[in-house]
Amino acid sequence: LMGGQDKPFLSARPSTVVPRGGHVALQCHYRRGFNNFMLYKEDRSHVPIFHGRIFQESFIMGPVTPAHAGTYRCRGSRPHSLTGWSAPSNPLVIMVTGNHRKPSLLAHPGPLLKSGETVILQCWSDVMFEHFFLHREGISEDPSRLVGQIHDGVSKANFSIGPLMPVLAGTYRCYGSVPHSPYQLSAPSDPLDIVITGLYEKPSLSAQPGPTVQAGENVTLSCSSWSSYDIYHLSREGEAHERRLRAVPKVNRTFQADFPLGPATHGGTYRCFGSFRALPCVWSNSSDPLLVSVTGNPSSSWPSPTEPSSKSGICRHLH
């Protein structure tokens, strides 16, 4: 991690992917410490601010412009050497986002997957991007990069993620770059949450007043478990979104969430999952499916009494 013999290690916090106008801290780690260091940009563009300047512990760059994108290296202070400086560090690529229209990001077969499965994340755009980049929120490593395939006026790339483990769950975004500006990326795609299920014991799902109800009757689905889940997620077969609620401890030592569905119109098959606050994208096994039947004259689909989560937002904490 820390580079070789006389080589410092240059890293970026929080990430090498920086939005236009944002800030990033560059750290040059040399000889088991953060010493004084000098910075260089390989293409020498834009950075008069570096020339002859010595930085202490970290360099805060920003607000960044497209011209900040590129490859950086540092040299650590080495007072007793001939030059006074170490060998150059590893190259660090800083990518600046927000320079072109955002691409779209889709998951095949879908964003809800079992542990061990593989998912294809497809990034596509009608902008002729040469490369696509896939980045997971909260990690400082460089994003994955693929060459875009152009077909019928659309450029796209398929990123294969798997076999899925808890560490791969999270919020993904993709970006595109055009030829000649490889590190000036597009605006981010809408976030896509990849959720891994099957890691903990399944909760139980029940309906009040029961699974068979009269049209117009109020129905509540209760998800509960002996496991101390923080959040429960309720999904309905055929619907893209899920609802979530905070789990409440009950006197019988179970943890429960009650989802009010409102007046019954259409039935459906429901499942619920539990998750912990620390790993919001890692869910339990699915509860046994619960078929809710509505007798009488169904009109339209069931109303949503609460604002449903869309394909994104699942991996954010529920405050």
Epitope: V24, E57, M61
Partner: antibody
């Protein structure tokens, strides 16, 4: 959205100390620094120095070395300016502003008026 | 220290006029110049940095240009809400230094 909220006005006697706070929100506090700028009555803007919120290392302009101290409490995303042995000429509005090694100050606090008078 | 000499110190313009404020650095500052707007009773607001990069949310009637020691802020069609003091600042080398300010008034 990025916001910097400074503590209220202060009236102090010569020789006293004052501590001005600047609470940041809307961004990751440790990825940027905090610059401090003084605006004395009838004068322009004068850069006092800054503190790197990632490393905690402060840097002071020549005229502000000695009685002026920058500090941080990253747990509450707050930067502080402490001035000791106050003099009448320290009477000014003090601004905090987000910025890093490149010296661009992209968001500013509302300013804190410090009046030094006997 | 780098001295930033700003001119004029005061200007009066009519709504719709093109307004130009200049700043001269005492040495080459390699395009590391920012411009700020300070309205009465408010803190300064960043308009432009690296000579010509507009900050988020800044109207496109504000533009910056220049190189070497000479830099310009232009308001292509001044509006009533642009009444303020405008400051240039070099961010080439510490200590960062500001110009003396230009007060813009609407006739």
């Amino acid at each position: 959205q990025v916001q910097l909220v400074q503590s209220g006005s202060e009236l102090k006697k010569p020789g006293a100390s004052v501590k001005v706070s600047c609470k940041a929100s809307g961004y990751t506090f440790t990825t940027a620094g905090m610059q401090w700028v003084q605006k004395s009555p009838g004068q322009g803007l004068e850069w006092m120095g800054w503190i790197n919120s990632h490393s905690g290392v402060p840097k002071y302009a020549e005229d502000f070395k000695g009685r002026f101290v920058f500090s941080l409490d990253t747990s509450v995303s707050t930067a502080y300016l402490q001035i000791s042995s106050l003099k009448a000429e320290d009477t000014a509005v003090y601004f905090c502003a987000r910025g890093g090694d490149e010296g661009v100050m992209d968001y500013w606090g509302q300013g804190t008026t410090v009046t030094v008078s006997s | 220290d780098i001295v930033m000499t700003q001119s004029p110190s005061f200007l009066s313009a009519s709504v719709g006029d093109r307004v130009t404020i200049t700043c001269k650095a005492s040495q080459d500052v390699s395009t590391a110049v920012a411009w700020y707007q300070q309205k009465p009773g408010q803190p300064p607001k960043l308009l432009i940095y690296w000579t010509s990069t507009r900050h988020t949310g800044v109207p496109d009637r504000f533009s910056g240009s220049g190189s070497g020691t000479d830099y310009t802020l232009t308001i292509s069609s001044v509006q009533a809400e642009d009444v303020a003091v405008y400051y240039c600042q070099q961010h080439y080398s510490t200590p960062w230094t500001f110009g003396g300010g230009t007060k813009v008034e609407i006739k």
